[in-house]
Amino acid sequence: SERCDDWGLDTMRQIQVFEDEPARIKCPLFEHFLKFNYSTAHSAGLTLIWYWTRQDRDLEEPINFRLPENRISKEKDVLWFRPTLLNDTGNYTCMLRNTTYCSKVAFPLEVVQKDSCFNSPMKLPVHKLYIEYGIQRITCPNVDGYFPSSVKPTITWYMGCYKIQNFNNVIPEGMNLSFLIALISNNGNYTCVVTYPENGRTFHLTRTLTVKVVGSPKNAVPPVIHSPNDHVVYEKEPGEELLIPCTVYFSFLMDSRNEVWWTIDGKKPDDITIDVTINESISHSRTEDETRTQILSIKKVTSEDLKRSYVCHARSAKGEVAKAAKVKQKVPAPRYTVELACGFGAT
């Protein structure tokens, strides 16, 4: 047999499907590796061949397309399971070839079991909804191509284990689930079960996603520096430890690089020849607003250090702010016996 361009095991496509449900898997060759599509390949006389390696086996074997009720079939560049079984788990290979050309790629397929409340090892996509933002929708994902547009499936939506009906602010609308006004209480896993008929049989597609309610862009503000502020003065004697916290609140903003940093005399702390350390802690609210605290610490401060400018800066996609800490050298208290006595004219 002639040499075949082997693209190896494409781990990018970690395909997970539920047991006892239909699954349609496109050959990744045409989507990611070759410059032409299936129709072009087919009309050029190339044949698409499928085979697989069972889980925990090394032996490649052909896929049996002669199972009862055509349980596994191929249609153009799609491999169909109607439905899947647990032992269909394995690495699947699609190979495109003729007498002079050969190209193949493998991908892992995992058939996953779910319980009656749709819990499973399936990796769930996360959909973020803005809190109190008006009507927002989620759509039942990855159901295209399973049935023709002439077929009208029935769709049932669940939150966790419970069928969604007569919920206050969540309304099923076919393939969509509408949140009239998203609240923290709407956090959770939502499942759509799509039921459709095909050749006298009934099939179910189960799709679960996680909804996370986050801060709304309507309420988003530039970073707010709570500390340092004008009310606190960091008064130290040389030799003492100087600790200045910078505490910043960030509104939740999708894909924002929230940042806090200190400058000392306009430079980054690393560039100043003093022994300064900065430690940071981060906490999140339930709507993923963020509070960052960076504590600037100088173990043994000098009188020179107490004359420097310490500025905390913060930036998010909403803007940038800065606040200087009020740092000063503590005036030593008078020693009574010497200074005060002198004042009384003692000799």
Epitope: R257, K268, D270, I278, Q294
Partner: antibody, heavy 119, light 107 residues
């Protein structure tokens, strides 16, 4: 003095996964810095791949986002890059770097490691 | 993405010369710009951050200026070790992008 050192295979097959590690010494990856990856194809300019904050939050170049993962390993004081489904266009010198927050730029860099994608 | 254009692409100069390299951003980036020096086979080295602040340990003959969309790196008196390629990088907006580089050669 902070030092960064990349390690990983110098040759990766097309469609394989490029995996590199950056060991950090002389400082902790728990400090408030962004740990970044930058690459440079032979004879070409620099391209920012992405970054991870000490808290684990990541940002990626959209041109690579679907294929890239950057992760931290606090116990080993190192961070890693995984680039999946590589092609010849991913052949480059890969650098790890430490970036400060805000406008501070990349102040510490590894020496770079050449990764060639070829069968 | 924000595009950075550097000019000139190539620059021939002599030891002792004063040289300036320009970096222009396709949109405003405030002062979120860094300058790097790279020698063949070596990693980039940070020279300037925040458009005009000299990185610790970098000779004072290097200086940076500019804000918004137009930035300049100046070397006041070229030394033999300064012949290298210089890159600007914007740190304002994702993805962070680099300029195409300016190669500084000995005349």
């Amino acid at each position: 003095q902070v030092q960064l050192q990349e390690s990983g295979p110098g040759l990766v097959k097309p469609l394989g996964t490029l995996s590199l590690t950056c060991a950090v010494s002389g400082g902790s990856i728990s400090n408030s810095n962004w740990w970044s990856w930058v690459r440079q194809p032979p004879g070409k300019g620099l391209e920012w791949i992405g970054e991870i904050y000490h808290s684990g939050s990541t940002n990626y170049n959209p041109s690579l986002k679907s294929r890239v993962t950057i992760a931290l390993d606090w116990s080993k004081n190192q961070f890693s890059l995984q680039l999946r489904s590589v092609t010849a266009a991913d052949t480059a010198v890969y650098y790890c770097a430490r970036y400060g927050s805000g406008p501070f730029g990349g102040d510490y860099w590894g020496q770079g490691t050449l990764v060639t994608v070829s069968s | 993405d924000i595009q950075l254009t550097q000019s000139p692409s190539f620059l021939s100069a002599s030891v002792g010369d004063r040289v300036t390299i320009s970096c222009r951003a396709s949109q405003g980036i405030s002062s979120y710009l860094a300058w790097y020096q790279q020698k063949p086979g070596k990693a980039p080295k940070l020279l300037i951050y925040a458009a005009s602040t000299l990185q610790g340990g970098v000779p004072s003959r290097f200086s940076g200026s500019g804000s918004g969309t137009t930035f300049t790196l100046t070397i006041s008196s070229l030394q033999p070790e300064d012949f290298a390629t210089y890159y600007c990088q914007q740190l304002n907006t994702y993805p962070f992008t680099f300029g195409p580089g300016t190669k500084l050669e000995i005349k």
